[in-house]
């Protein structure tokens, strides 16, 4: 049978041939009658065999990490017979390891993110090195990790390569760290090989900083003419945190006047001071408000960093604007009786300069020929007024500052012309009446009514009478209906068209004014030749024809 031991050949041997071992048959008595042969991958190139003795030699340098074992076949032949002495047999040559490979970090580059202010012991990342040497061969591939750079903030577990935090870090002081880790094989013993890697450790932000105002005092100005909602300026705080942790909200902490507000521009992180109520330089020309700023998002566990909000004081100066004169009233209503002489007093308007300098005021009336106004605001008439022509006047009074004629205010002034009883009542229309020749006594000829151009505080009441001469010798009489109408009646029987074709009756109409006014109104009554029915219609028709130049039979 075959006789051999386990074959080992150390890697990386520099000699030209290295004796590996000897293959032999137990039938070989050493008389050189046997021939040994080597077959398989590596036979003849890497390994050779002494055909006579069966000694095997490695003829080139081996690398275990490239190939750790060779499987070869051995044959032995009897030279005299040419026959196989032993059956062909497989055997193994193992390449034994030497520590010729340093540890390598194959997953480079390493980058980790860890929240700032993380406590000691917080896991950051695990780095792992690989050693191509044989892990089962002594300590060639047994690694130990150590920190070359990164103290005192980081530590590495020697056997696992786990990097942990060893000291709290503040991102606002330094936001990233380069840590250098070394891996040594041979568990760090002399002759060990080493490899290093760099780990970039970035600190993520936590909200451990409150916003703080850049200035302890801001000075802003606002014009007294500024409307509510006007932005009058900006204030700004800074926050050393980033992103969402630096988002802030501004608010008013103190503004007794409740005149201002602060809104936050979330894009620029500025506070915008807004006018909430109009200001008046003459009332108050400066304001002080206190503003505060807080982060928008604060986690409960970080509240300790946000106990007292940063505040700032804002001095706001109101800028004076030359304002137009201010009338005491938004409008005026005056009354004056009609028929008062020109130059009569109507009323007084008053405007003042609201500014501190108190400019004198000049007054004027826009487009009026009836009224005048002086520099004291006294309105007088330039003509006598007639209520029956115009009962109301709508005036526009203008006040102008003497020192700045561009500062003008106008208000409406309404003048009511009050009635006096200066008009007597008169017929409401022209009356033309007709009476038949054959009319009987007491026949109604005409109903009349009156109008009075005067205004009556109460109802007008008119009194109707015939004139004295008509009363004494009249063929007609009048009855007052007590409702501002009266009826004219015949006072005799029969009339004669030839003798008296027309009657002119004077009617007195008096009003109930104080004093009472009376007018004389003439009623024309035509005598007509009527048919048997007593109708005056034909008479009226005849009158119409005559007036048009026609003659009737």
């Amino acid at each position: 049978g075959w006789v051999w031991n386990q074959f080992f050949v150390p890697e990386e041997m520099n000699t030209t041939s290295h004796h590996v071992g000897r293959l032999r048959s137990d039938l070989d008595n050493g008389n050189n009658s046997f021939q040994y042969k080597l077959l398989g991958a590596g036979a003849g190139s890497t390994f050779i065999i002494d055909e006579r003795t069966g000694d095997i030699y490695a003829i080139e340098k081996l690398d275990r990490e490239e190939r750790s074992l060779y499987i070869l076949r051995a044959q032995v032949i009897d030279i005299t017979t040419g026959r196989a002495v032993e059956p062909e047999s497989e055997f193994v040559i193992k390449v034994s390891d030497i520590n010729d490979n340093e540890p390598k970090f194959l997953d480079e580059p390493y980058e980790a993110i860890v929240p700032e202010m993380s406590p000691e012991g917080t896991l950051v990342i695990q780095v792992t090195a690989s050693d191509a040497d044989d892990p089962s061969s002594g300590n060639n591939a047994r690694l130990l990790y150590s920190l070359l750079q990164g103290q005192p903030y980081f530590s590495v577990e020697p056997t696992t390569g786990v990097i942990r935090i060893s000291s709290k870090m503040d991102r606002e002081l330094q936001d990233e760290y380069w840590v250098i880790i070394q891996a040594k094989d041979m568990i760090g013993q002399p002759g060990a090989l080493s490899g290093t890697t760099s780990v970039l450790i970035k600190l993520s932000d936590v909200n451990d900083n409150k916003p703080i105002f850049k200035e302890s005092l801001y000075r802003l100005t606002v014009s007294e003419s500024a409307p509510t909602g006007t932005s009058i300026g900006t204030i700004m705080a800074y926050d050393n945190d980033i992103g969402e942790n630096a988002e802030m909200d501004y608010s008013i902490e103190e503004d007794d006047s409740q005149t201002f507000d602060i809104i936050t521009n979330h894009e620029t992180q500025e506070g915008i001071v807004i006018l909430k109520k109009k200001v008046n330089f003459e009332h108050q020309n400066h304001y002080g408000i206190r503003a505060k700023v807080k982060n928008h998002h604060v986690d409960k566990q970080l509240m300790k960093y946000h106990t007292e909000a940063s505040t700032t004081f804002i001095k706001i100066q109101v800028e004076d604007v030359d304002e137009p004169p201010l009338f005491l009233l938004p409008y005026y209503i005056f009354e004056i009786f009609e028929e008062t002489p020109q130059g009569s007093f109507v009323g007084v308007v008053s405007a003042t300069d609201p500014d501190n300098r108190k400019s004198p005021i000049r007054y004027s009336i826009t487009r009026s020929k009836v009224f005048n106004i002086d520099d004291n605001g006294t309105i007088t008439t330039t003509n006598s007024l007639d209520r029956e022509i115009s009962a109301w006047y709508n005036l526009s009074i203008t006040a102008t500052e003497k020192y700045n004629i561009e500062q003008i205010s106008s208000i409406p002034v309404y003048v009511q012309v009050l009635n006096i009883n200066d008009h007597a009542p008169e017929f409401s229309q022209y009356y033309e009446s007709y009476v038949c020749e054959n009319a009987g006594s007491g026949q109604v000829i005409q109903t009349i009514s009156a109008v009075d151009r005067d205004e009556s505080i109460e109802e007008h009441h008119f009194y109707f009478n015939l004139s004295v001469e008509d009363t004494n010798s009249s063929s007609f009489t009048i009855i007052d209906n007590q409702d501002n109408t009266a009826v004219i009646l015949t006072n005799r029987t029969g009339f004669n068209l030839q003798e008296e074709p027309i009657f002119y009756i004077s009617i007195l109409i008096a009003d109930n004014g104080i004093p009472s006014l009376t007018s004389t109104n003439t009623l024309t009554i035509h005598v007509c030749d009527c048919d048997d029915s007593g109708s005056t219609q034909t008479c009226q028709y005849q009158e119409l024809m005559l007036s048009m130049g026609f003659k009737t039979e």
Partner: antibody
């Protein structure tokens, strides 16, 4: 320490002019609004004028408006009051005063300079 | 303008006594914008109280201010010899105006 020193007072005839100065030291002059206040002999205090910290705004009492001008030179840390068309009633000790940073009261005053207007 | 009226015109007291000075405004003084000063003969005024009740730097706590709106007061709890002077109130709500002063004299 904060110091304000007025100068430029004296006797002047009515209608003439005078310029008062106030030298400031011991604080950042350019950060404070500054005022002039006067006190007629045996009388109370009367505010005269104010100028803003940056010199952009000035306000005056009605009694001096149009006649007095307040100004400042930050490079010299000096406040001025130019008084024109002086009247007898302008006779007073003139004080310069610093306005409080967080308020509008006057926390520091100079020792004053006397202006006498008489013929 | 806001007119300040101080009363009394003169206050005659002894050292150690309590002094109460009054200042009344013709219209409401916004945000308690009122200050008190004292002035010794031949000297410049000195700020005692601002904001109606806040003591200025270096002012002893025997001085206290109170009030709001139109009625304000300065109280000196126990008069010291150096407290005998003229006291002025000043409003700075609308421009700056002073009261006519109250003289605190030794009785």
């Amino acid at each position: 320490q904060v110091q304000l020193v007025e100068s430029g007072g004296g006797v002047v005839q009515p209608g003439r002019s005078l310029r008062l100065s106030c030298a400031a030291s011991g604080f950042t002059f350019s950060s404070y609004d500054m005022h002039w206040v006067r006190q007629a002999p045996g009388k109370g205090l009367e505010w005269v004028a104010v100028i803003s910290y940056d010199g952009t705004n000035e306000y005056y009492a009605d009694s001096v408006k149009g006649r007095f001008t307040i100004s400042r030179d930050t490079s010299k840390n000096t406040l001025y009051l130019q008084m024109n068309s002086l009247r007898a009633e302008d006779t007073a000790v003139y004080y310069c005063a610093r306005e409080r940073y967080f308020d509008w009261s006057f926390d520091y005053w100079g020792q004053g300079t006397l202006v006498s207007v008489s013929s | 303008e806001i007119v300040l009226t101080q009363s009394p015109g003169t206050l005659s007291l002894s050292p150690g006594e309590r002094a109460t000075l009054s200042c009344r405004a013709s219209q409401s003084v916004s945000n308690t914008y009122l200050a008190w000063y004292h002035q010794r003969p031949g000297q410049a005024p000195r700020l005692l109280i601002y904001g109606a009740s806040s003591r200025a730097t270096g002012i002893p706590d025997r001085f206290s201010g109170s009030g709001s709106g139109t009625d304000f007061a300065l109280t000196i709890s126990s008069l010291e010899p150096e407290d005998f002077a003229v006291y002025y109130c000043q409003q700075y709500s609308n421009s700056w105006t002073f009261g006519q002063g109250t003289k605190v004299e030794i009785k």
